[in-house]
């Protein structure tokens, strides 16, 4: 039975040109995390594999940085980055858990600074 839950950074509003940290944390399960995929719509952004480490999709290499932890840092944000992002936790023996974060990137100045979300 899947008992785990995913906690996310929550939805975020950010400024064009800035950077943002997307993070998820899987709790309430003893399942082993084998891989975490980060996706936007149907595009794979990055993979963090427990054995092989990080792989960033070539088309995002310039603007996506791994971490902190299992999270993902998006840099040089554009309005086109507005959308829903998914953290997909592949675990054994539970299976797959998915977290969802919506990111809104605005032209004008946005008062959201200083990420305080940390993986426990």
């Amino acid at each position: 039975m899947m008992t785990g839950t995913i906690e996310t950074t929550g939805n975020i509003s950010a400024e064009k040109g800035g950077s943002i940290i997307l993070q998820c944390h899987l709790s309430s399960t003893t399942a082993q995390v084998t891989q975490v995929n980060w996706e936007q719509q149907d595009q794979l952004l990055a993979i963090c594999n427990a054995d092989l480490g990080w792989h960033i999709s070539p088309s995002f290499k310039d603007r996506v940085a791994p971490g902190p932890g299992l999270g993902l840092t998006l840099q040089s944000l554009t309005v086109n980055d507005t959308g829903e992002y998914f953290c997909i936790y592949h675990t054994y023996p539970d299976g797959t858990y998915t977290g969802r974060i919506f990111l809104e990137v605005l032209e004008s100045s946005v008062a959201e600074h200083g990420a305080r979300f940390q993986i426990p």
């Epitope: 929550g10 719509q41 507005t82 829903e84 969802r100 809104e104 305080r116 979300f117």
Partner: antibody, heavy 119, light 112 residues
């Protein structure tokens, strides 16, 4: 003045599909997210999903995945919601609502479209 | 999904009364950047819902100052001082911090 003008009431048969339109005016259509909300069972409000007119990106309430399909026509500043394989459970009033920038709220709402599913 | 619970379900009032509506969420509505996306709406019969308060306590343009919002974390309140006839209807809170956004069940403000 911001306005969202929705299409008129619909009476449709079970199993059919239909499309509701929401024409936006008074602001730059591509600058704001468009949400869709269902009002059913008297007073219950349920978020269906949203679309980003700028890039066509969508986000759905999983309860409506496969039930609702959201699109936009930027040239006419119109958002659309197609409802698929309708049943009596889909009889409701449907609203489009503009997203308030920075605050994940809904600042302007359409007048609502009443959908009745009946044979 | 985040569960949003509103109380009371029904609120009988007299004109001139001051009332409070409570909205509680099953998890914190503060995101990792310290922002809380909690808004309040009034839905009058035969009309569309209208935004009253966003970001916990910000009044939307044109909303009278007898409406005020407060709270943090999981516990939020809408206060209406000096109830007027045009304030009657269904009140809803909406959390927009977590996907999918979820509404409270509503509070019906009606005359005693």
């Amino acid at each position: 003045e911001v306005q969202l003008q929705q299409s008129g009431p619909e009476l449709v048969k079970p199993g059919a599909s239909m499309k509701i339109s929401c024409k936006a005016s008074g602001y730059s259509f591509t600058d704001y997210i468009m949400n869709w909300v269902k009002q059913s069972h008297g007073d219950n409000l349920e978020w269906i999903g949203l679309i980003v007119p700028y890039n066509g990106g969508t986000s759905y309430n999983l309860n409506f995945k496969g039930k609702a399909s959201l699109t936009v026509d930027k040239s006419s500043s119109t958002a659309y919601m197609e409802l698929l394989s309708l049943t009596s459970e889909d009889s409701a009033v449907y609203y489009c609502a503009r997203g308030l920038q920075r605050f994940y709220a809904m600042d302007y709402w359409g007048q609502g479209t009443s959908v009745t599913v009946s044979s | 999904d985040v569960v949003v619970t509103q109380t009371p379900l029904s609120l009988p009032v007299s004109f001139g009364d001051q009332v409070s509506i409570s909205c509680r969420s099953s998890q914190s509505l503060e995101n990792s950047y310290g922002n809380t996306y909690l808004s309040w709406y009034l839905h009058k019969p035969g009309q569309s819902p209208q935004l009253l308060i966003y970001g916990i306590s910000n009044r939307f343009s044109g909303v009278p100052d007898r409406f005020s919002g407060s709270g943090s974390g999981t516990d939020f309140t809408l206060k209406i001082s000096t109830i007027k006839p045009e304030d009657l209807g269904m009140y809803y809170c909406l959390q927009g911090t977590h996907q999918p956004p979820t509404f409270g069940g509503g509070t019906k403000l009606e005359i005693k």
